[in-house]
């Protein structure tokens, strides 16, 4: 019995069937970021909760040291939301002083690291200027897309300013991936 | 014949196979919200179109009384976008009056209700300060992530200010979920 | 052997099984938009990279002439992010001149074209007022949802102002779809 017997008639080659409940999946939630050493010239990576509350990893998808480890090759949907929170915007201060107002910005990057490849690959980026009039502000950046990943690839979430990340609630800042 | 015969060689235990087209799925679209009574101290829940236009429910995923009812346990991807529209920002009025400008905000929460559990669980939250200079403004908040749900769980979308929701078009404000 | 033998006991009718790796999928990334003729009274459509870098199409999902062509009927998750970048906001200029400040806006629409249907269908819209104080600004609009599509349907991404799209990086502006 071959998997392709179930394929639509126009489809000749057919990959083996597998149960959906067995696929690698993870949903990670925010935890407080303690000050750590970050790589120079690289946005700092967030670390995550992987088993408490809404967070989980399953079917060989493991979380370790800020990375999600991809256990098998395939197409994955990867997503993250980071909620940022600031007490003021330097942009408005610059504006008041009458100097040209280059905006502040907040950025989230989902990055893939492949050990055999020297440079990390930026899979997704959400970046937004912040030039708020208010004395305090907050807003989310959401990202999500599908990528072909290889067994052993590692995923992380990098942010432009780790001190602005809202880590007060697990539903505000999160990171996940699942094999399609 | 057991499902695991199709499993990759490194996989011992294997859940039964099932066809993708048979999985519970729903995409709901916005409808006009008439003023109604809401629970005290809780963001009001939106109600939705479930069968006209782009909206649908299928494979035992049912919509009733503002809730999506989860018909079988498993991992679901859940998403929503709410477009908000305001005629002014009180923040700007407060600012003009020279008082400290606590920003207005808009918030979307996707909430899970489990009958056996006393408190609803907030799965996803998108929250954004609104301190617009313009006399009218509009913007979406998008959310999406994967969660492990149980048969009988109910999902709803709550918003901070129901009177700011743009319900003029089905592509602007929507809510969906599908079993992975 | 019938597909439904693997179905949960409460499920009578069951679609044929098929391997996940065989499903139509695409992730397209931004390329520089050269000035072209657009349809009158319709937002211009973006064109995309479909094979270099992070971009791919597979399993009969084809990209041609700004469209993703749907090769088989079913439920698809469709997503896009467009990052916009502006050097100024007319809104702030209007404001300084003391005239009423109707905001500028940025809009992304994911549109379905069905040859047998005269009018395109707007599946998803993200629209945001832009009334920035800063002299330059940038921000993403993200969209994603599930839709029932028919074989032969075509998908495109339309934007309100093609000259504001940030096409500098493949992780900032993208478009994808996959059969569930």
């Amino acid at each position: 019995l071959k998997g392709q017997e179930f394929a639509p008639s126009h489809q000749q080659v057919y990959a083996p069937l597998r149960a959906d409940g067995d696929k690698p999946r993870a949903h990670l939630t925010v935890v407080r970021q303690t000050p750590t050493q970050h790589f120079k010239n690289q946005f700092p990576a967030l670390h995550w909760e992987h088993e408490l509350g809404l967070a989980f990893t399953k079917n060989r998808m493991n979380y370790t040291n800020k990375f999600l480890l991809i256990p098998e090759s395939g197409d994955y949907f990867i997503y993250s939301q980071v909620t940022f929170r600031g007490m003021t915007s330097e942009c408005s201060e610059i504006r008041q002083a009458g100097r040209p107002n280059k905006p502040d910005s907040i950025t989230v990057v989902i990055t893939k690291v492949t050990d055999s490849y020297p440079e990390p690959t930026q899979l997704l980026m959400g970046t937004k200027s912040v030039c708020e009039v208010g004395s305090n502000w907050f807003q989310p950046i959401y990202l999500g897309a599908m990528f072909s990943l290889q067994e052993g690839d590692k995923l992380m979430v990098n942010v432009s300013d780790i001190s602005l990340v809202d880590y007060t609630k697990e539903d505000k800042t999160f990171f996940g991936a699942f094999l399609l | 014949l057991k499902g695991q015969e199709f499993a990759p060689s490194h996989q011992q235990v294997y859940a039964p196979l099932r066809a993708d087209g048979d999985k519970p799925r729903a995409h709901l679209t916005v409808v006009r919200q008439t003023p109604t009574q809401h629970f005290k101290n809780q963001f009001p829940a939106l109600h939705w179109e479930h069968e006209l236009g782009l909206a649908f429910t299928k494979n035992r995923m049912n919509y009733t009384n503002k809730f999506l009812l989860i018909p079988e346990s498993g991992d679901y991807f859940i998403y929503s976008q709410v477009t908000f529209r305001g005629m002014t920002s009180e923040c700007s009025e407060i600012r003009q009056a020279g008082r400290p400008n606590k920003p207005d905000s808009i918030t979307v929460v996707i909430t899970k209700v489990t009958d056996s559990y006393p408190e609803p669980t907030q799965l996803l939250m998108g929250t954004k300060s609104v301190c617009e200079v313009g006399s009218n403004w509009f913007q979406p908040i998008y959310l999406g992530a994967m969660f492990s749900l149980q048969e009988g769980d109910k999902l709803m979308v709550n918003v901070s200010d129901i009177s700011l929701v743009d319900y003029t078009k089905e592509d602007k404000t929507f809510f969906g979920a599908f079993l992975l | 052997l019938k597909g439904q033998e693997f179905a949960p006991s409460h499920q009578q009718v069951y679609a044929p099984l098929r391997a996940d790796g065989d499903k139509p999928r695409a992730h397209l990334t931004v390329v520089r938009q050269t000035p072209t003729q657009h349809f009158k009274n319709q937002f211009p459509a973006l064109h995309w990279e479909h094979e270099l870098g992070l971009a791919f199409t597979k399993n009969r999902m084809n990209y041609t002439n700004k469209f993703l062509l749907i090769p088989e009927s079913g439920d698809y998750f469709i997503y896009s992010q467009v990052t916009f970048r502006g050097m100024t906001s007319e809104c702030s200029e209007i404001r300084q001149a003391g005239r009423p400040n109707k905001p500028d806006s940025i809009t992304v629409v994911i549109t379905k074209v069905t040859d047998s249907y005269p009018e395109p269908t707007q599946l998803l819209m993200g629209t945001k007022s832009v009334c920035e104080v800063g002299s330059n600004w940038f921000q993403p609009i993200y969209l994603g949802a599930m839709f029932s599509l028919q074989e032969g349907d075509k998908l495109m991404v339309n934007v309100s102002d093609i000259s504001l799209v940030d096409y500098t990086k493949e992780d900032k502006t993208f478009f994808g779809a996959f059969l569930l």
Partner: antibody, heavy 118, light 107 residues
Framework: QGQLVQSGAEVKKPGASVKVSCQAS????????MHWVRQAPGQGLEWMGW????????NYAQKFRGRVTMTRDTSISTAYMELSRLRSDDTAVYYC???????????WGQGTLVTVSS | DIQMTQSPSSLSASVGDRVTITCRAS??????LNWYQQKPGKAPKFLIY???RLQSGVPSRFSGSGSGTDFTLTISSLQPEDFATYYC?????????FGQGTRLEIK
Amino acid sequence: QGQLVQSGAEVKKPGASVKVSCQASGYTFTAYYMHWVRQAPGQGLEWMGWINPNSGGTNYAQKFRGRVTMTRDTSISTAYMELSRLRSDDTAVYYCATGGSWEGFDYWGQGTLVTVSS
Amino acid sequence: DIQMTQSPSSLSASVGDRVTITCRASQSISSYLNWYQQKPGKAPKFLIYAASRLQSGVPSRFSGSGSGTDFTLTISSLQPEDFATYYCQQSDSTPITFGQGTRLEIK
């Protein structure tokens, strides 16, 4: 089903002020903006402004700024509209109205006739 | 401010007639247009929102169309209870503004 009940008719002299009340029932008062619309005899509808009952924030039409004040008392689900320095051309029926969003007013008060006459 | 202009100001028609009222905005208001019906001595009644979407409980003989600056309200087959004054209203931006009204009378 929501309902808005307004205070009774008023007769005022030019230069005086009038305060019209609007009591809401059947829906969550604080969740929906309350608008005020007036209609002079034989004339069309004219929007005056709104109040956000939750925050107390207001937005007034330019024509009425400086003369109109909209307030609310959430404990009794009531909105108020006060118009000062009344003139004879302020003679009109004043309506409170609310809706699920900006897109239309579902519920209207029965109207309050304010007559300004010396 | 956005000006709303209705035409005609008044019209006479008979029961069973098809009637169209137009409303023009002084600038684009997308589809943020609503229609009301008002009878003498009564508060307005909400009919149509978002240019074309029927408010719950409104008979299907009422329909709306248009976007941008030009809009129409159509009554496909006039009934005795439809004789009233009709107003369009834009909800695109403040100040919210109404058309001057169209009075529909029995011929």
